[in-house]
């Protein structure tokens, strides 16, 4: 006799892992033999998909590799003609091992900022993500939490964060591990110890120290006057992420000496700066300080205008005498190149006569001033208009140091030959005659303040620097 | 770090020629004088030749005038000198040293290691 | 021609002090010739310990003091150390016609 379908064995919900087998089993009693049909999520299942396997006249339906996205309702649908259609439904749950679906990467944060790395994970049932940093679990804290998402979130991310990470996805199924990241955290240059400003007498040599620190450890470059250095010698040392530089100066004029530190985060660089100053203290001048000694010069810029193995004094007051002495020397012969002609010879031999002078030689050695005629002939005769263009200078501040203060004698303090002539040197290179002063260049309107002495005469019937010549 | 580093030398037969180099770093190379100074085997220091800090002036032993020739490259930091004539005599290690000043004698503060030169048939 | 002489070696007990000198073959050592001396070790370069008649280079311990006795110049070293074992020279800057500067032929000197 025809009978209606009757399910006998309802679906039940069933549970699979990915790529493993589930079957769903759809036992019917009827006659004649219904036809079975399958759904899933009300969708038919085509007889013909081979990831299906329908058997036992369309009873049992496997799929044969779990794919996650097979989850849903499952529907078995029995008709035969007699009576109506029956229906049963079940729940595949695919079941999963956790699965890393974005993983963490390598991070580059600046300090204090706020660090994310990422990790977002699939699993059933769904994975709880915990973090590991070198080989401990990860506490979190108020700074360091683990979002919902299962990325690891830290505000204000400080030095000590910096290190290896990788986070760990774990179900009742199994574990799974993502692969180690490195957190690098980066520190803006800071100075530690900025260099300290001095008050040092002139010819000194002073020792700028700066540190500064940062990751990557930070460079340092000064700066002297709001321009590179261009003179000292610079000496560095790395330890400990903190960079040590001394910048070693032979102190001839005042300045602002900037310490700066830079370090690059990626296309951006970071600087911290310091700035210390360096100011000439009052000194005495060579003729009111007889702390010296007498040596043969030996340098380069006076070499044509001191006599070949002229003694000269050399002032204890600096602290390296020669080179001082020799870089002032130096420094005002460059002022000189603009100078005229005539000025020049002139000046140059009142400059090396004057910061090179002539040391007698004793139990106390003592410098022997220029006599003041052979000054006033360079001031008020070689050297009238260039003399009131430095004074103008000197008095309006255009130079750049003291040291021309320091290189051009006044003329009315130095003794005169007329004196004691052994009490003061002679410039054996200003050798002329009245006649001379005939070619020589209008004087100034002020009359000499003394009067410029009958030198003696020569052969020579113009103005001379050569060292053969003497005045004696 | 004051640093000197010597180079070129070598063996030479006599009336060879060499050119040593010195490459300075560590210091501000053109505010300084420099000077080589030599030993051979076994014996004292002999200075050889010495420049101030911008060239120009140049000195030598007397032994050394017209066969040998300093010079500098303030832009390479690099100190030379040109050998020219050699004699067994000259058979020594070269020092490069770095005056403590501007002047072309002021004391040697800073020695190089070396280079050697043989002179020898 | 200059020639600088010293004592060709010289021998002091550790602790104790010794003076080397660095004299001329015609006339007196004075500040003129910037008397410097300088340390040499067997294999290594020379290292500077005085300038100038007096002034110590930088990072050289004060045992170490340069001056003029009489018509030469003197190396003094004071409380003498084992390490202080080595060759000394003394440079002299020199003036007869044209500049120049003249090494001693050295010290050796042995602490017992």
């Known amino acids: 006799l025809p009978k209606a379908p009757v399910i006998t064995t309802p679906l039940e919900t069933v549970d699979a892992l990915v790529e493993e087998v589930a079957t769903f089993m759809c036992a019917v009693e009827s006659y004649p033999q219904p036809e079975i049909s399958w759904t899933r999520n009300k969708i038919l299942i085509k007889l013909f998909d081979t990831r299906y396997s329908i058997r036992e006249n369309g009873q049992l339906l496997t799929i044969l590799s779990v794919e996650d996205s097979d989850d849903g309702i499952y529907c078995c649908t029995a008709n035969n003609g007699v009576g109506g259609a029956v229906e049963s439904c079940g729940a595949l749950q695919v079941k999963m091992k956790p699965k890393i679906t974005r993983p963490p990467i390598n991070v580059k944060i600046i300090e204090g900022l706020k660090a994310v790395l990422p990790c977002t994970t699939m699993g059933n049932p769904k994975p709880s993500v915990s973090w590991i940093k070198g080989d401990s679990p990860l506490r979190e804290n108020s700074r360091i939490a683990v979002l919902e998402s299962g990325s690891l979130r830290i505000h204000n991310v400080q030095k000590e964060d910096a290190g290896q990470y990788r986070c760990v996805a774990k179900n009742s199924l199994g574990t799974a591990y993502s692969k180690v990241v490195k957190l690098e955290v980066e520190v803006f240059a800071r100075i530690l110890r900025a260099p300290e400003s001095h008050n040092v007498t002139f010819g000194s040599f002073v020792t700028l120290h700066c540190t500064a620190t940062g990751i990557p450890v930070p460079t340092i470059t000064w700066i002297e006057n709001g321009n590179a250095v261009s003179s000292g010698s610079i000496q560095e040392s790395v330890k400990d992420r903190v960079i040590d530089s001394r910048l070693q100066l032979f102190i001839t004029k005042p300045g602002l000496y900037t310490c700066i530190a830079t370090n690059k985060h990626g296309e951006k660089f970071s600087t911290a700066k310091a700035a210390a100053t360096i100011s000439i203290a009052e000194w005495s001048k060579p003729q009111k300080d007889n702390k010296g000694y007498c040596a043969q010069y030996r340098g380069e810029v006076c070499n044509a205008v001191l006599a070949k193995d002229a003694l000269v004094f050399l002032n204890t007051s600096y602290a390296d005498p020669e080179e001082a002495q020799e870089l002032l020397v130096h420094t005002a012969w460059n002022e000189l190149k603009v100078v005229s002609p005539v000025c020049r010879p002139a000046a140059e031999a009142l400059l090396c006569n004057h910061i090179f002078q002539e040391c007698s030689p004793g139990v106390v050695p003592t410098p022997i001033p220029i006599c003041r005629e052979y000054c006033l002939a360079v001031k008020e005769l070689f050297c009238a208009k260039e003399w009131l263009v430095m004074e103008e200078k000197t008095h309006r501040g255009l130079y750049r140091s003291e040291m021309h203060l320091l290189s051009v004698p006044e003329c009315s303090k130095l003794p005169s030959m007329h004196w004691d002539p052994t009490a003061c040197a002679r410039l054996p290179h200003l050798d002329y005659n009245k006649e001379n002063l005939k070619t020589f260049p209008p004087m100034t309107s002020s009359k000499p303040s003394v009067d410029i002495p009958n030198l003696p005469s020569s052969s020579s019937s113009s103005f001379s620097v050569s060292p053969t010549y003497s005045m004696t | 770090e004051v640093q000197l580093l010597e180079s070129g030398g070598g063996l030479v037969q006599p009336g060879g020629s060499l050119r040593l180099s010195c490459a300075a770093s560590?210091?501000?190379?053109?505010?300084?004088?420099m000077s080589w100074v030599r030993q051979a085997p076994g014996k004292g220091l002999e200075w050889v030749s010495a420049i101030p800090w911008q060239g120009g002036s140049t000195y030598y032993k007397e032994s050394v005038k017209g066969r040998f020739t300093i010079s500098r490259d303030n832009s390479k930091n690099t100190l030379y000198l040109q050998m020219n004539s050699l004699r067994a005599e000259d058979t020594a290690v070269y020092y490069c040293?770095?005056?403590?000043?501007?002047?072309?004698?002021?004391?040697?503060?800073?020695w190089g290691q070396g280079t050697l030169v043989t002179v020898s048939s | 021609q200059t020639v600088v002489t010293q004592e060709p070696s010289f021998s002091v007990s550790p602790g104790g002090t010794v003076t080397l000198t660095c004299g001329l073959s015609?006339?007196?050592?004075?500040?003129?010739?910037?008397p410097d001396w300088y340390q040499q070790t067997p294999g290594q370069a020379p290292r500077t310990l005085i300038y100038s008649t007096d002034s110590r280079h930088s990072g050289v311990p004060d045992r170490f003091s340069g001056s003029i006795l009489g018509n030469k110049a003197a190396l003094t070293i004071t409380g003498a150390q084992a390490d202080d074992e080595s060759d000394y020279y003394c440079g002299l800057y020199s003036y007869s016609g044209s500049k120049n500067y003249v090494f001693g032929g050295g010290t050796k000197l042995t602490v017992l």
């Open positions: 015609s006339g007196s050592v004075t500040s003129s010739n910037y």
């Open positions: 560590g210091f501000t190379f053109s505010d300084y004088g």
């Open positions: 040293a770095k005056r403590s000043g501007r002047i072309a004698f002021g004391a040697l503060d800073a």
